[in-house]
Interface confidence: low
């Protein structure tokens, strides 16, 4: 009769570092004691007529282990294949791009560490939770690596690495791990330079917008922008549409900047940069300032007009060209009557860069003269007839401007000036009319013919 | 912090001349202009001129007919006004201020100077 | 020169109350590079005078936002939403688009 030995449990699974407790026993009735062989620390538990029963600690590592017992003088052996499964210690995906250009292509790396059995442990490669790749895990450490073509659709997605420990034909179900989420950020930065639009000249203390613009730019609200005059850097607002970047920022040419100069627009995305870069010049121009020697003057006084501007400017006053560019241009006159109120207009123009600039300034001259009523328009003999409407149209000029009164000789009756007003058979005599200011007094005598209303 | 410190009170003789110092601080003194403004007693304020401290520009108001001038001593940064051929009328409050070239007024003041002319 | 006239003279309020200061240029204020360089100062009792408002509706730093500046060519105000008790002194327009730079002649903000 042959007798067996068995091994119990069969073929256990168990996970990396576990206890298992195992069992021997023989049907032969006259066994020796019962032995078992292994690698593993072992403990006799308990034993008895025919059995054994061990405790296997710190398991780590698959293993075989062997009961042998002598019976009738012949040794029966029994075995047990132990299999250990343990999950990954590290689940790393590598590090992605800071910036990765759409249309090219980009390498996702997985790295694991540890995980038993590898014949059970799969590698799978995610782009949010669309599976990439799926490879075994092989070396250890296993690294499993993807080829992706980069689009915008990946601006902003978490690729992540995932290990699938599957057990299930054990019974003990699917173990996953997952590496923290890597975010990727693609772009597109077109070869074409910026547009930028920008003065040609700008004068010293002045300002005026600068634009710079950039199409086709993904994602544009990353983009940085750097707009400068010269060294000086300037304070952009930047602005977003669609794939559109623009930034406009306010250029003030500061008098140590004076000359030729350089407006530049650097735009960059993704570690790249696209630059417009603009010829400025940076011009001086004061002036023109037109001066009077005496902006209010007395009739026969000699008034001096002059009339200037900054350096390389030409100015001409009242048709006169001054000498020289930079030169003062000068009139002198005899203040009269007639140049009351004269304006005196000089222009200024100064060349930059082949191209001329104007300006203009004019200043008004006032002269004082004494009151004058001017006869032609102030009838010395008047037939009017009674109660009719009529105007005294007499007029005075001077300057301050005088007051005019026409007053009855004799009587302290005064006619209203350039009013109408009905005339009636008192108003027959004769009238002082009198200019006055405060540079004298012009008198001029009217007489008034009223012919009496006949009824008949 | 910006600060402009002028000089002491002045008591001056009708015909004379007076100088005004203004030294600056808290920024660099060559990329700012520079003006003077002054205030009569109980009266608003008049522009007198103004200097750019890094040309030595200068900018006057033709009212004052040649009798102010405007000077700069960028080793010190320190800007000067001297009015001459001094009458009773000149009796003001004399003030700095500086201006950037944007935004183009008067962002600091000086504490002011008092000069009185007196017989 | 540009003659700036500033409208009151005096103007008594009462704290909390909305305050209104109107200046007015006798000639267009819009300088060839299009900006229009009016300006606005307050000067406190025995103080210089300080920066409010510049190039018409700009608040200098650290102005408070109950004071705005407004217009356009020729005509401005500047108006304050509550008066408080350090808003009290005299207020100044001041152009500097044309040489000579000129100033309002002043409206006095005090207590009614």
């Known amino acids: 009769q042959e007798f067996l030995l068995r091994v119990e449990p069969q073929n256990p699974v168990l996970s990396a570092g576990g206890s298992l407790f195992v069992n021997c026993s023989t049907d032969c009735p006259s066994s020796e004691k019962i032995a078992l062989e292994t690698s593993l620390s072992k403990e006799l538990v308990a034993s008895g007529m025919g059995w054994a029963a061990f405790n296997l600690s710190n398991v780590t590592g698959n293993s075989r282990i062997l009961c042998s017992v002598y019976c009738n003088g012949s040794q029966i052996t029994g075995s047990s294949n132990i299999t250990v499964y343990g999950l990954p210690e590290r689940v790393e995906l590598a590090p992605l791009p800071p910036w990765q250009p759409v249309g090219q292509n980009f390498t996702l790396r997985c790295q694991v560490e540890g995980g038993s059995p590898r014949t059970s442990l799969t590698v799978v490669l995610l782009r949010w939770e669309e599976e990439l790749s799926r490879q075994p895990a092989v070396e250890e450490p296993a690294e499993v690596t993807a080829t992706v073509l980069a689009s915008r659709d990946d601006h902003g997605a978490p690729f992540s690495c995932r290990t699938e420990l599957d057990m299930q034909p054990q019974g003990l179900g699917l173990f996953v791990n997952t590496s923290a989420p890597r975010q990727l950020r693609t772009f597109v930065l077109p070869v074409t330079p910026p547009r930028l639009v920008a003065p040609r000249f700008l004068e010293v203390e002045t300002s005026w917008p600068v634009d710079c613009t950039l199409d086709g730019l993904f994602p544009a609200s990353e983009a940085q922008v750097y707009l400068a005059l010269g060294d000086q850097m300037l304070n952009a607002t930047v602005m977003n549409h669609g794939d559109t970047l623009t930034a406009t920022a306010t250029a003030t040419a500061r008098a140590d900047q004076e000359g030729a100069r350089e407006i530049v627009c650097n735009v960059t995305l993704g570690g790249e940069r696209r630059e417009a870069r603009e010829n400025l010049t940076v011009f001086s121009f004061l002036g023109p300032i037109v001066n009077l020697s005496e902006p209010t003057a007395h009739e026969g006084s000699t008034v001096t007009v002059s009339c200037m501007a900054g350096a390389r400017v030409q100015v001409t006053l009242d048709g006169v060209p001054a000498a020289a560019p930079g030169q003062t241009a000068q009139l002198q006159l005899n203040a009269t009557e007639s140049d009351d109120g004269r304006s005196f207009f000089c222009s200024a123009t100064l060349e930059v860069d082949g191209e001329f600039l104007h300006r203009n300034s004019s200043v008004q001259l006032r002269v004082l003269y004494g009151p004058k009523i001017d006869r032609a328009t102030c009838p010395q003999h008047l037939k009017w007839k009674d109660k009719t409407r009529h105007v005294l149209q007499c007029q005075a000029r001077g300057n301050p401007y005088p007051e005019l009164r026409c007053l009855k000789e004799g009587s302290s009756r005064e006619v209203p000036v350039g009013i109408p007003f009905f005339v009636n058979v008192t108003h027959n005599g004769t009238y002082q009319c009198q200019a006055s200011s405060s540079r004298g007094k012009y008198t001029l005598v009217v007489v008034m013919d009223i012919e009496a209303f006949s009824s008949h | 912090q910006v600060q402009l410190v002028q000089s002491g009170a002045e008591v001056k003789k009708p015909g004379a001349s007076v100088k005004v110092s203004c030294k600056a601080s808290?920024?660099?003194?060559?990329?700012?202009?520079i003006l003077w403004v002054r205030q009569a007693p109980g009266q608003g304020l008049e522009w007198m001129g103004k200097?750019?401290?890094?040309?030595?520009?200068?900018t006057y108001n033709l009212k004052f007919k040649g009798r102010v001038t405007i000077t700069v001593d960028t080793s010190t940064s320190t800007a000067y006004m001297e009015l001459s051929s001094l009458r009773s009328e000149d009796t003001a409050v004399y003030y700095c201020?500086?201006?950037?070239?944007?935004?183009?007024?008067?962002?600091?003041w000086g504490q002011g100077t008092l000069v009185t002319v007196s017989s | 020169d540009a003659v700036m006239t500033q409208t009151p003279l005096s103007l008594p309020v009462s704290l909390g109350d909305q305050a209104s200061i109107s200046c007015r240029s006798s000639?267009?204020?819009?300088?060839?590079?299009?900006?229009?360089?009016l300006h606005w100062y307050l000067q406190k009792p025995g103080q210089s005078p300080q920066l409010l408002i510049y190039?018409?509706?700009n608040r200098f730093s650290g102005v408070p936002d109950r004071f705005s500046g407004s217009g356009s060519g020729t005509d401005f105000t500047l108006k304050l939403s509550r008066v408080e008790a350090e808003d009290l002194g005299v207020y100044f327009c001041?152009?500097?688009?044309?040489?000579?730079?000129?100033f309002g002649g002043g409206t006095k903000l005090e207590i009614k």
């Open positions: 001041s152009q500097s688009t044309h040489v000579p730079y000129t």
């Open positions: 808290g920024y660099t003194f060559t990329d700012c202009i």
């Open positions: 190039k018409v509706s």
């Open positions: 201020a500086r201006k950037e070239a944007y935004p183009d007024a008067m962002d600091y």
């Open positions: 000639q267009s204020l819009v300088h060839s590079n299009g900006d229009t360089y």
């Open positions: 200097i750019n401290p890094y040309f030595g520009t200068t």
